[in-house]
Every structure is written in C-alpha cells, then in structure tokens.
C-alpha cells in the first residue's frame, strides 16, 4: 500500500500545512474561554466543559468524540466547617488563626465555587501539639533531624516548606517520622523571584496565596478504591481502610503570611545550616515548640475535609488512521483545575484544542493520518492522575497491543525562557529533527531554529551542541502509559531559566491567582511560546502518526543504558568492601547493555535498507520499534510498587516528580549502610541487578532479526 493512499499531498507538505494552520490568536481565545470559572474535578462546571469540548472537537472534524466516565474517590473541604490552623494558649483559646481563603484576584471577587486551599485526601482531625520545622520534608531532611540533630518528630505537628519534591512524598516522610499532622507552606525563597511584584502586579506569590494539591502516595494505582481496574458501574471498591495511598495524618497548606506567624515563635534547635533557611524574617528554628514566653502555646489543626466517590468525565476524540487504524498515537492533557487553571492545565488544554482544530481542518480537506490519533481531555489529574489511569486500565489490552506513543499536554508554560522536553530515548531524534525545522520564538534568536535557541539556553550536560532532554518522572498523565504499560512517551513545555530562578515550579502554581490575566499580562502576551509548544507537541504527534517508518531511534536507548549502568555501578562502588564480601557483580548488566548496543546498531542498519514498499516487512519493522518500550516492562513490577513496571525508569521513591534510572537497583542500594540485615540487603541488590540485566537482554532480543 502507498503510505499516502489517503491523500494526494506529499508528507512534507502535510506537516507544513498542519503547522501553518496553528494560530496563536486561537490558543489565546481558547485559554480565555477555559479559564473564566473554576473547573474542579467532580463538579458540574467541569462536566459542562467536558460536553463543550466534546461538541467543539466534533465540529472541528474528528470522526468520533465520546465521554468516558468513572466513579472515583475525590476529596473536598466541608463548606460549612472550614479547615484552618490556630495557635492556642495554655487555656485552649485560639489566639491566632490562619486564613480561611485566599484574597480573590481583581475581577474575580464575585466568582462562586472557588475551593479554598486544602490538601486533597487529608483525613479529618484536630491534632494539637508542638511544632517542628522540617525544611522541605525530604528524606535527607528527616535524616538530618533524626540522625544528626537527634530531634524526634513523634507526636509533633511538622511544618514543611513546599518545593524540591512532590508534596505526597513530604507527607509520607512525616508519617514515617511519627508526626501527627503536617503544615505545608510556600516560602518566598522558593516562590518569590527577587525583583518581581506579587500578583496582580506581577507573577510572584502574594503572602495570602496558597498552593493546593493532593497528598497521595498512589505509586501509579489510579483510583484509590479500584487499583488495577477501572472504576466503572460494576466495580468492586475497597473499603476506605484498604484504599491505596491515602495519608493517615491531617495535612493543610498555608501561605507565607500565615507561615510567618507560626515560624517566628519557633524555639528549640537552631537550623543546622543555611540550606534550612528560607527568606522569611524568622529564625527558622527547628523546635520542637515555641520559644521562651510562648512555650506554653501550641499549634492546633482543624481539618474537616471529606473523601467522596464522585463521577468524572474524560473526553476521547478519534481521528481514524487511513493505513494503520489499529495503531494509536495519543495526545492527552487534563481539563480539571484547582481553581481557574490559567497555566495548569488550561494553557495545555488550549494548545490541544488548537491542535485538534488544525488536524480537523486537514481532515475536512480530504487528508487522513497514516495511523489513528486519539485525543484526550483527562479529568481528575489533580486528584492523582485518575482520569487517564482509569481509562488506560479500561483499555489496557488495546493499548498494550496498539499503542505507538503518548504525548502529554499539561501546562504549556512554566516560564518563557526556553523549551523543556522529557521523553523516552526513542524520541530524542524525533525531537531534535523537529525543533531544527521550527522557528525559535525567543528574543535574540530571530530567524534561528528552536533547536539552536534551546541548545544555547539549555545545553546537554553530556553532549556538546545538543540540548538537554530529561528523564520522564511522574506527577502527570503520561504515568500510566509509560510506567505501567510501556508506551513510548514524551512531554514538552516552555520553562524558566533554572540557573537564575531557583524557585520551585512557578510561584502561583495551584493558587487562585493562576488566571488568564497571569498568562496574558506576564508570561506570554503574544502567545508565541504557546504557539511554539503547540508546534512541538503537534509536530511530534504528526510525525508519529504519519511517518512511514516510526521515528524512533533505538541506538539512543543503547547510549543511555550505558550511562545509567555506569551511574548505578558508581553508586554501588561507594561500598567496595560489601561488594566484595557479598560477591556483587554488575558484569551481567554491562554485558546485556553491550549486547543491546550491538543489536540496536544492526537493527538500525536494516532499517535503512529494507524494502519499504513491502507492507508486511514495514509493519514488522515498525512493530519491533513500537514494542521496544514494551520490552522494558516487568509484569511483576518494582518492589512494593506493582504499577511501576518499567525497569529502566520509575518515579523516584523520594520524589514522584523526578525520574530514576534502574530504579530497582537504586532503591535496593539506597541507605544500604543503615540496614539491619546487610546480607539480606545486598542479596536484594544482586536480585535487582539480575532483573535489570535480564530485562535489557530480553529487550535487545526483540530487535534481533526475527528468523
């Protein structure tokens, strides 16, 4: 079959026609439309937006657009019994209370249904006790507290600053330390860039601004009550006591104005070093408890949120492939927001909307992609990636057989400095080639390619003349596709300058101030960065769906496998005596990586030479490429994390947002010197090396000549 049987336009012209149809003005218009009211998961407003998007995608020309609903566990504050934190005196009188809501931004004073700041899935409770400041509540922060400073958090309420790691990891660490409550706050050191004004006069976080967010430790499970299976009409639901990933202690977020009032009274130990000090005018004493005159005062939490099984709605649009309709390229991003979603997610949803419109325009002119493209507007991402995970659980058999690639489309911007890409190594060459064809939107790079500005501003730490591409972690909707199902995945957005802006994420993340005006006034007035992200995301989807040979280069996987093997070996070699004592060898892993490299090289040679007019051989070669990512899946999953099944990559056990390479070996080696049974611990290291070596070897063999 001709690869262009569905059209008389050349593939090159198709891509150009697709990209030329994308318009910044449309993205701007869509963003405005999506951000005028809150679209919290499980609410009527978000259901109405789902139906609007369904209707518009149909108008744009997709073959079908369906709503896929699930009944999942969500969490909401009690409307009549608000959450807050107080300082109480010795008589139990509340002498200070934290704010009940954020001061609304100008023009939004009369908007109803703004959910007040809360930590989703916090249990109810009213713990009171002494405060301990735990810095970012990372694993290493608790090591410092417990091991070096001999401070016991048991029975204490801990206060941690947001940033560096996923908030759910902070809560898990606090629970393991024995805390009875957690207060999360945004420190200006992390959420206030010097020299920039607070919203509404700039893009910084005001003192009353608060970051919402879920505090689950799902490890890829999806709906906490139906792990592994879709939360459909006939689902069997676990009891709340058996639910996956729920926190066991009350948690609440506050802004830095309220944090000041709590932290300024702290006594006890001084901070261990300057890395524990933020930018507030307080001592950053660790505690426990308040100083001198205030030592009889305690902190009390009042948390009354409820967990409720609630219906959510994904929108799934289909553009059927002309040649390989049973091969799916998926573009997905979420629709639900904490409040207005000016950046997260609607800057992404607006881009997806424009990509759908452009594809629809081409389809109306008689064109079809070679492969089927699925477009998804996911629900309840903010509550634990629930919409995408439930849909993938429901369709897992189709996806594992037919899924070519997944491109994520959450926030298009987190800054306006340069491009940021995280993806499977299979997509490195696709991203490089595409960005060489796109124009840079950056000032000072007029007439230059996106590749050039990206490489200049964000150079690869390993390869000169190339841009940095990061590992996939989690915290977004690609998780189930990549980490559980082994579908090649990628994401792209515009980001900040990490060298000069060391705050975590963007300052107004998950606050009421994440509005349309934030984007239009301060981040991207011309919507040129949004357009560039649309070109990158859309261009990747176009190539993946339309190229005759899948644009995957397996040799790039070989390169990173060697790098990751070297890295994990060097970590293990910090314990040379134990490696000798317990006969720990990485020979099998290095041998497997060597074999993978040789086989990948030979496969690439065959890929250049085979007869592309033979549809059977073409399909066979493409299947080997498509199934390579799948070959890295271990059906048994990682230890204690059955839904993280990718052997090469997993979200870090210490930070869900970050990706870790050879995670099974890494976790087995982590803090191994403190293990009570070293023989058992090093035995697990050996087992994990075995699993990794076997998996790499098995993946290599999928690229061998089939007969």
């Amino acid at each position: 079959k001709s690869s262009n049987e569905a059209t008389n336009i050349t593939p090159k012209h198709n891509m150009k026609a697709f990209l030329d149809e994308l318009k910044a003005e449309n993205i701007k218009k869509f963003l405005y439309n999506f951000t005028q009211i809150p679209h919290l998961a499980g609410t009527e407003q978000n259901f109405q937006l789902a139906k609007q998007i369904q209707s518009q995608w149909k108008e744009f020309g997709l073959d079908s657009v369906e709503l896929a609903h699930y009944d999942v566990l969500l969490s909401y504050p009690n409307k009549t019994h608000p959450n807050y934190i107080s300082i109480i005196n010795e008589d139990g009188n509340e002498i200070f209370n934290t704010s009940l809501f954020e001061p609304p931004p100008p023009g939004y004073e009369n908007v109803s249904d703004i959910v007040p700041p809360f930590s989703a899935f916090s249990p109810q409770g009213m713990p009171e006790g002494d405060l301990v400041y735990v810095n970012y509540a990372r694993t290493e922060d608790f090591f410092k507290l417990e091991r070096d400073m001999k401070i016991n958090c048991s029975g204490k309420i801990v206060i941690a600053r947001y940033g560096k790691v996923f908030r759910g990891n902070k809560v898990k660490n606090a629970q393991l330390a024995g805390a009875k409550g957690v207060i999360l706050y945004s420190d200006p050191a992390d959420y206030f860039a010097p020299g920039v004004k607070s919203y509404p006069d700039g893009w910084n976080l005001p003192g009353g601004g608060v970051q919402r967010g879920n505090i689950l430790n799902l490890n890829g499970a999806g709906d906490p009550l139906t792990p592994g299976y879709p939360a459909n009409e006939y689902a069997y639901r676990r009891g709340i006591a058996e639910a996956v990933g729920l926190p066991s202690i009350p948690v609440h977020p506050i802004g830095y104005y309220d944090a000041q009032k709590l932290l300024e009274k702290m006594g006890g130990s001084a901070p261990p070093d300057s890395s524990w000090r933020g930018s507030l005018k307080v001592p950053y004493n660790v505690g426990p408890g308040f100083t001198g005159n205030f030592s009889t005062q305690k902190v009390k939490m009042h948390i009354h949120s409820t967990n409720e099984v609630t219906r959510i709605y994904n929108v799934i649009g289909t553009l059927r492939g002309a040649v390989e309709p049973d091969r799916y390229v998926i573009l997905g991003g979420h629709r639900d927001s904490w409040v207005f979603g000016g950046i997260d997610p609607q800057s992404g949803a607006a881009v997806v909307h424009e990509i759908v419109r452009s594809f629809g325009t081409l389809k109306k002119e008689g064109w079809r992609p070679r492969r089927t493209i699925l477009f998804a507007s996911w629900d309840a991402e903010e509550f634990g990636l629930l919409g995408s995970t439930e849909w993938a659980e429901e369709n897992s058999r189709l996806l594992q057989e037919r899924g070519v690639a997944y491109i994520n489309a959450d926030s298009s911007i987190e800054g306006n400095y340069t491009l940021r890409v995280d993806c499977t190594p299979l997509m490195y060459s696709l991203v490089h080639n595409l960005t060489k064809e796109l124009k840079s939107p950056d000032e000072g790079f007029e007439g230059k390619s996106l590749y050039e500005s990206w490489t200049k501003k964000s150079p690869s730490p390993e390869f000169s003349g190339m841009p940095r591409i990061s590992k996939l972690g989690s915290g977004n909707d690609f998780e189930v596709f990549f980490q559980r199902l082994g579908i090649a995945s990628g994401r792209a957005r515009y980001t900040k300058n990490w060298e000069t802006n060391k705050f975590s994420g963007y300052p107004l993340y998950h606050s009421v101030y994440e509005t349309y005006e934030l984007v239009e006034k301060f981040y991207d007035p011309m919507f040129k960065y949004h357009l560039t992200v649309a070109q990158v995301r859309g261009g990747m989807v176009f190539e993946l769906a339309n190229s005759i040979v899948l644009p995957f280069d397996c040799r790039d996987y070989a390169v990173v496998l060697r790098k990751y093997a070297d890295k994990i070996y060097s970590i293990s070699m910090k314990h040379p005596q134990e490696m000798k004592t317990y006969s720990v060898s990485f020979d099998s892993l290095f041998s497997a990586v060597k074999n993978f490299t040789e086989i990948a090289s030979k496969f690439s040679e065959r890929l250049q030479d085979f007869d592309k007019s033979n549809p059977i051989v073409l399909r066979m070669m493409n299947d080997q490429l498509m199934f390579l990512e799948r070959a890295f899946i271990d059906p048994l999953g990682l230890p204690d994390r059955p839904f993280y099944r990718h052997v090469i990559y997993a979200p870090s056990s210490h930070n869900k947002y970050a990706g870790e390479s050879f995670p099974g070996i890494y976790d087995a080696l982590f803090d191994i010197e403190s293990k009570v049974d070293p023989s058992k611990a090093w035995g697990e290291v050996k087992r994990q090396i075995y699993v990794a070596a076997f998996t790499v070897q098995a993946a290599a063999e999928t690229l061998s000549e089939v007969a």
Partner: antibody, heavy 121, light 106 residues
Framework: EVKLQESGPGLVKPSQSLSLTCSVT?????????WNWIRQFPGNKLEWMGS???????NYNPSLRNRISITRDTSKNQFFLKLNSVTTEDTATYYC??????????????WGQGTLVTVSS | DIVMTQSPASLSASVGETVTLTCGAS??????LNWYQRKQGKSPQLLIY???NLADGMSSRFSGSGSGRQYSLKISSLHPDDVATYYC????????FGGGTKLEIK
C-alpha cells in the same frame, strides 16, 4: 486609590468604651490584606493595637487583649475599634491602616489621617 | 514584648549632609524591621520594609541596613523636605515601635 477615614467621638469618659469606625474606599476589605488600628500617644509614642483580616480573623496586642475588640461590616466596607474600660492613659490619636506584606514582612502601607480621642471626665 | 530603642531622640543636621539613625531591638528580630517617616500634621508613611527594601515612591537617598538586633537608616544628601520624625517598627512576633527620632534642619 485606597483611602481610609477614621470617625468617632473625640471625647470619652473614663471607664466607658471608646468606639471608632474606619471607612475604606477604593478596595474591598474582604478582598485581601489585614486592617489595623494604631494609636499615637501625646508624647509621640506609637502603639499597634490589633487587626482584622480579610477573612475576619483577629490579632490583638497582648497588652490590650482583655479590653479590645475589632469587628467589621462588609456591606459598608467599614471596620471598627471598641476599647473597653478606658482611662486617661488611652488619650491618643487613633489611626486605621492597611497592612501589606512582602516576603512575610508586615508593614502599614495606607493610613487614615488619624482622629484624636481624649479621655476625660 | 520586644522593646525597640531609637537613637538619637532628636537630631539637627545641615542640608546636603548624610545622617544615620539607629534602632536597637531587645532581642534578635531577624530583619523583620520597618522604618516610617511622619511629617508634622501627617500620618506616618512607609519608608523601608524588611530592614533593607525601599518602599515604592520613596527617594533612593534613604537606605536601610542591619540584622539581628541592630538596624540603621541612612539619609544621604539631606533635603529640607526630610524634616520629620522617623520611627522603626519591629514586626517579629508582635508589632512594636521605637520612640522615634526627630530630625530637624540646622
């Protein structure tokens, strides 16, 4: 432009209650910030008395806690000071002020023009 | 309460001179200190916040410094318009003001 204006009786008898109103224009007191009362004694010494936040929470100077109350009427965009059991020591110029914040450091950005209250029999 | 002590209580200087006002706290206030200027018959006006940050609309001739318990306000190239009483304010834990420094022109 944000404006604050104090009003209330200029003369109060000892042991009675002092009541003042601060009327705010140009900004809704429920939209943000903390709304404060500060007084200046005849010798020019300034004393912060207390505040009410945009969401109705109070914070008081511990030295006045037993006799101070700060309330508000959101429909009129006003907040009020009530000081019980006054003595001649409470004679002062009373200011209302809006508190701003930066990096968690509090400060008073907008002030009323002040109203003199004399406590005398 | 944290006690704020300003010195001198009053100061007379000539136009064009540089003057320094000091403010001491009875304990460490970690930079949580503001300076206000109050002209005769007017309400106080914010001058410096967070010990070192110049408030919007104020002349760059004013600068704040200090940490821990000791803070100072420097006024360079004195103008006749600078005649006022200057107050420091502690905003650590509770809010307390210094007694003020009255600045006059010789």
């Amino acid at each position: 432009e944000v404006k604050l204006q104090e009003s209330g009786p200029g003369l109060v008898k000892p042991s009675q209650s002092l009541s003042l109103t601060c009327s705010v224009t140009g900004y809704s007191i429920t939209s943000g910030y903390y709304w404060n009362w500060i007084r200046q004694f005849p010798g020019n010494k300034l004393e912060w008395m207390g505040s009410i936040s945009f969401d109705g929470n109070n914070n008081y100077n511990p030295s006045l806690r037993n006799r101070i109350s700060i309330t508000r009427d959101t429909s009129k965009n006003q907040f009020f000071l009530k000081l019980n059991s006054v003595t001649t020591e409470d004679t002062a110029t009373y200011y209302c002020a809006r508190e701003g914040d930066y990096y968690g450091s509090s400060f008073f950005t907008y002030w009323g023009q002040g109203t003199l209250v004399t406590v005398s029999s | 309460d944290i006690v704020m002590t300003q010195s001198p209580a009053s100061l007379s200087a000539s136009v064009g001179e540089t003057v320094t006002l000091t403010c001491g706290a009875s304990e460490n206030i970690y930079g949580a200190l503001n300076w206000y200027q109050r002209k005769q018959g007017k309400s106080p006006q914010l001058l410096i916040y967070g010990a070192t940050n110049l408030a919007d609309g104020m002349s760059s001739r004013f600068s704040g410094s200090g940490s821990g318990r000791q803070y100072s306000l420097k006024i360079s190239s004195l103008h006749p318009d600078d005649v006022a009483t200057y107050y420091c304010q502690n905003v650590f834990r509770t809010y307390t003001f210094g007694g003020g420094t009255k600045l006059e022109i010789k």
